[in-house]
Amino acid sequence: GSERTCCPVNWVEHERSCYWFSRSGKAWADADNYCRLEDAHLVVVTSWEEQKFVQHHIGPVNTWMGLHDQNGPWKWVDGTDYETGFKNWRPEQPDDWYGHGLGGGEDCAHFTDDGRWNDDVCQRPYRWVCETELDKASQEPPLL
């Protein structure tokens, strides 16, 4: 089959997922498209353990994740439920701030320099993280 059983070159494996960490910046939508052409998605953080793993790799640099509210409610790009899921916002965030003077509010989430999350203008050219899950079937034990 075409399912992945190991991570591509230059990707990092962690807990049955593969991660790719950019070293340059793009707008959120362009980063999202980059990941999708690689059969991945912007990183979806589902636990404190995953948060610490990503934070360790990106360092103190603004970095896009796969969370946005461009169509109203906050949504993870892979469909993970936002309301019941893991969150790590900075205090008083998200605030959909309009004071930046760039038009509109703030609809895309990113890791800040301390790892906590902030909402920001989606056109800002931040680094990003792609994530793809390894073949689910490969987690099952082999038939004897």
């Epitope: 075409s2 070293r23 340059s24 910046g25 498209n33 980059y34 059969d39």
Partner: antibody, heavy 121, light 107 residues
């Protein structure tokens, strides 16, 4: 050696359809993003479409959106471009290209030899 | 869409000359830029990616520079096999777009 061999070009009617094929070899096709790029006679290069390795994600130029469909059959190492509602502006050499992801960008390498599509009115 | 503008559209040069081709993006594209060479009747070939990285097998007389909106392809000492058309391509965002091309011709 990485190779792509296009086929299916030829004469098409305005308003009609054609399907291009590209058979790839020499690399792991199933995990490689692929693309179509075209070049009208005597003109420059124009990106047409791209598709992820699994085929789940596709991208199109505005000029072909809604008319062209890119698909792939990974069991046959083959990429397709279904071209509908053809117009004279679609006359071009169509190149099948392997997409490489480097340093956060998507680039084209290598290229097939191309197949000529001529649309007559 | 990001427009890519190349200049000049053609350049006349002799073997041994230093040739410089420029490419300008309509908005900033960081270093997401490639250069291709195309000879008549042939498919394009990748020369430079990520603005300045030389693709494997490409002679070192080719070099790329620039970031943001302005980029340059330089051929340090033109060889007979370098007479061709050169295209830039931005890889910052979809749709991926090419410059109009620069034809390097014999003086």
């Amino acid at each position: 050696e990485v190779q792509m061999l296009e086929s299916g070009g030829g004469l098409g009617q305005s308003g009609g359809s054609l399907r291009l094929s590209c058979t790839a070899s020499g690399f792991t096709f199933t995990t490689s993003a692929m693309s179509w790029v075209r070049q009208a006679p005597g003109k420059g290069l124009e990106w047409v479409s791209a598709i992820s390795g699994s085929g789940a994600n596709t991208f199109y130029a505005d000029s072909v959106k809604g008319r062209f469909t890119v698909t792939r059959d990974n069991s046959k190492n083959t990429l397709y471009l279904q071209m509908n509602s053809l117009t004279a502006e679609d006359t071009a050499v169509y190149y099948c290209v392997k997409v490489i992801a480097v340093a956060g960008g998507h680039f084209f390498d290598p290229w097939g030899q191309g197949t000529l599509v001529t649309v007559s009115s | 869409d990001i427009q890519m503008t190349q200049s000049p559209s053609s350049v006349y040069a002799s073997v041994g000359d230093r040739v410089t081709i420029t490419c300008r993006a309509s908005q900033g594209i960081s270093s997401y830029l490639a250069w291709y060479q195309q000879k008549p009747g042939k498919a394009p070939k990748l020369l430079i990616y990520a603005a300045s990285s030389l693709q494997s097998g490409v002679p070192s007389r080719f070099s790329g520079s620039g970031s943001g909106t302005d980029f340059t392809l330089t051929i340090s000492s033109l060889q007979p096999e370098d007479f061709a058309t050169y295209y830039c391509q931005q890889a910052n965002s979809f749709p991926l777009t090419f410059g109009g091309g620069t034809k390097v011709e014999i003086k």
